[in-house]
Interface confidence: low
């Protein structure tokens, strides 16, 4: 009779992490008589995976029911495969032997590689708000995936982005793997509604993308714009001071109105208009009784956005002056016509 | 559990039939599904079997070429696409569930009443 | 490709006997075997899987055994029920499935 053979037909075995791999091995006989045993690796160092004779192994199950005599089919089923699986197994034919039994013959192995979805990715941005004109950098990262192959992409609005820098990691062989990629954004003032986009595309994606995003409203810091105007008189003795905060955000404001370097009045935005770009305009009116001032009166608005230092802008108040509509020296910007219809 | 076929008929030799099999009383996607065919006064003879979800298709040397499985999981029904017919594909069509444990054993644990093709000139 | 030859073509036995149906693989299959029953003008019903475990609502007087290459369909005590063409099936490895040439159980 010909010697014993041990047969394992796959070269390599693919499975997706969560699944089940079924690693094949027949013998081509019974003799001699002996029990099978299933080692991930070879050598010293190898580990066994499952042993027909004794063991408990909660993850193995046979293919067949291997306590029968005439049985020569030893595939097992490994459950629940994750990429720490990842490795060749053999199949090892033992004779009966005293004490021990001894290895008779081993099958040429089965690489078993394990194939598992990236974890979403996470995007990250700058810890502190940035103005526009100003470039930063966004970090992408995504864990768990097998095998090392992965593309990632960056967006802002639907148009991908060209500045990044991609790592994954390790470099060498590794059951799983992760990706950290750093992209520049250069941002407008338009992007308080604007997006950053991270997109992974994976063998085990199926041709459907991961995406991670964040937007920049968490991001960008928009500075508002400053006009003080001068309004028609109410009364005999009274002026109407306005100043206009325009294209701001975040909303965090505080306002505070100095006459001749003197607080007057402290408010904080409430009831503010919001822009079609996310932005914020706000409007804030000091009443000045002019009949008590004897000179002319310095009336400064004086801002303080999102915890960054104060801007200001001032308005000449002539005590003399006719009553009638006067409009500052300093004006950042013309009125917007969404404010007209404040008054 | 119940299977219905449809589509059978009578076709001259090079033309083509679509096969339908109308699944009920299972969840259908969980399992493998064939179209098994039998000549008048003849054995059984498998045609062609597809996986659960579609991707993996595997037919006869006969059909191969000519015969096309696909399934729709979304209404439970199982299709042949036959072309080219031949007279020696006259036979009863039947569509048949896979009843086994393991995802490469392959053994009819229902059957439906089959569906008559007749291809002839 | 694996053969399986049944024998004999057909058998011929009387209500209440005992019936013994060969089907012989050219090759090992294991238990990889499933036996079916088909009644004139009726599709096939499954009988016997994995060589002997009985499907679902079968009565115990069918009886698959064998392994290997030789396995056997009993029917302890014949019912009038029971006359029809049986064909046995491997699963051991396909494609393609096949299934052996069918024994006829008719009334003697």
């Known amino acids: 009779e010909e010697e014993l053979q041990v047969i394992q037909p796959d070269k390599s075995v693919l499975v997706a992490a969560g699944e089940t791999a079924t690693l094949r091995c027949t013998a081509t006989s019974l003799i001699p008589v002996g029990p099978i045993q299933w080692f991930r690796g070879a050598g010293p160092g190898r580990e066994l995976i499952y042993n027909q004779k004794e063991g408990h192994f909660p993850r193995v199950t046979t293919v067949s029911d291997l306590t029968k005599r005439n049985n020569m089919d030893f595939s097992i089923r490994i459950g629940n495969i994750t990429p720490a699986d990842a490795g060749t197994y053999y199949c090892v034919k033992f004779r009966k032997g005293s004490p021990d039994d001894v290895e008779f013959k081993s099958g040429a192995g089965t690489e078993l590689s394990v194939r598992a979805k990236p974890s979403a990715p996470v995007v990250s941005g700058p810890a502190a708000r940035a103005t526009p004109q100003h470039t930063v950098s966004f970090t992408c990262e995504s864990h768990g995936f097998s095998p090392r192959d992965i593309t990632l992409k960056w967006f802002k609005n639907g148009n991908e982005l060209s500045d990044f820098q991609t790592n994954v990691d390790p470099v060498g062989e590794s059951v799983s793997y992760s990706i950290h990629s750093t992209a520049k954004v250069v941002l407008t003032r338009e992007d308080v509604h604007s997006q950053v986009i991270c997109e992974v595309a994976h063998v085990t994606l199926q041709g459907d993308p991961l995406r991670g995003t964040a937007n920049l409203s968490e991001t960008i810091r928009v500075p508002p714009t400053l006009e003080v105007t001068q309004q028609p008189v109410r009364a005999e003795n009274q002026v109407n001071v306005t100043c206009q905060v325009r294209k701001f955000y975040p909303q965090r404001l505080q306002l505070t109105w100095l006459e001749n370097g003197n607080v007057s009045r402290t408010e904080t935005a409430s009831t503010v208009t919001e822009n079609k770009d996310g932005t914020y305009n706000w409007m804030s009116w000091l009443l000045v009784n002019v009949s008590a001032h004897r000179d002319d009166v310095k009336l400064t608005c004086q801002v303080e956005h999102d915890g960054q230092p104060a801007v200001s802008k001032s308005h000449d108040l002539k005590v003399s002056a006719h009553p009638k509509e006067q409009g500052s020296n300093t004006a950042a910007e013309n009125t917007g016509s969404n404010e007209r219809n404040i008054y | 559990v119940q299977l219905v076929e449809s589509g059978g008929g009578v076709v001259r030799p090079g033309e083509s039939l679509r096969l339908s099999c109308a699944a009920s009383?299972?969840?259908?996607?969980?399992?493998?599904m064939s179209w098994v065919r039998q000549a008048p006064g003849e054995g059984l003879e498998w045609v062609s079997l597809?996986?659960?979800?579609?991707?993996?298709?595997y037919y006869a040397d006969s059909v191969k070429g000519r015969f096309t499985i696909s399934r729709d999981n979304s209404k439970n029904t199982l299709y042949l696409q036959m072309n080219s017919l031949r007279a020696e594909d006259t036979a009863i069509y039947y569509c048949?569930?896979?009843?086994?444990?393991?995802?490469?054993?392959?053994?009819?644990?229902?059957w439906g009443l089959g569906t008559p093709v007749t291809v002839s000139s | 490709e694996i053969v399986l030859t049944q024998s004999p073509g057909t058998l011929s036995v009387s209500p209440g006997e005992r019936a013994t149906l060969s089907c012989r693989a050219s090759?090992?299959?294991?238990?990889?075997l499933a036996w079916y029953q088909q009644k004139l003008g009726q599709a096939p019903r499954l009988l016997i899987y994995?060589?002997?475990t009985r499907a679902t609502d079968i009565p115990d007087r069918f009886s698959g055994s064998g392994s290997g290459t030789e396995f056997t369909l009993t029917i302890s005590s014949l019912q009038s029920e029971d006359f029809a063409v049986y064909y046995c099936?491997?699963?051991?490895?396909?494609?393609?499935?096949?299934f052996g040439g069918g024994t006829k159980v008719e009334i003697k």
């Open positions: 048949a569930k896979d009843g086994a444990a393991h995802y490469y054993d392959i053994f009819f644990d229902y």
């Open positions: 009383g299972f969840t259908f996607s969980n399992y493998a």
């Open positions: 597809i996986t659960t979800n579609g991707d993996g298709a």
């Open positions: 090759q090992n299959v294991r238990s990889d």
């Open positions: 994995d060589a002997n």
């Open positions: 099936q491997h699963y051991y490895d396909w494609p393609p499935v096949t």
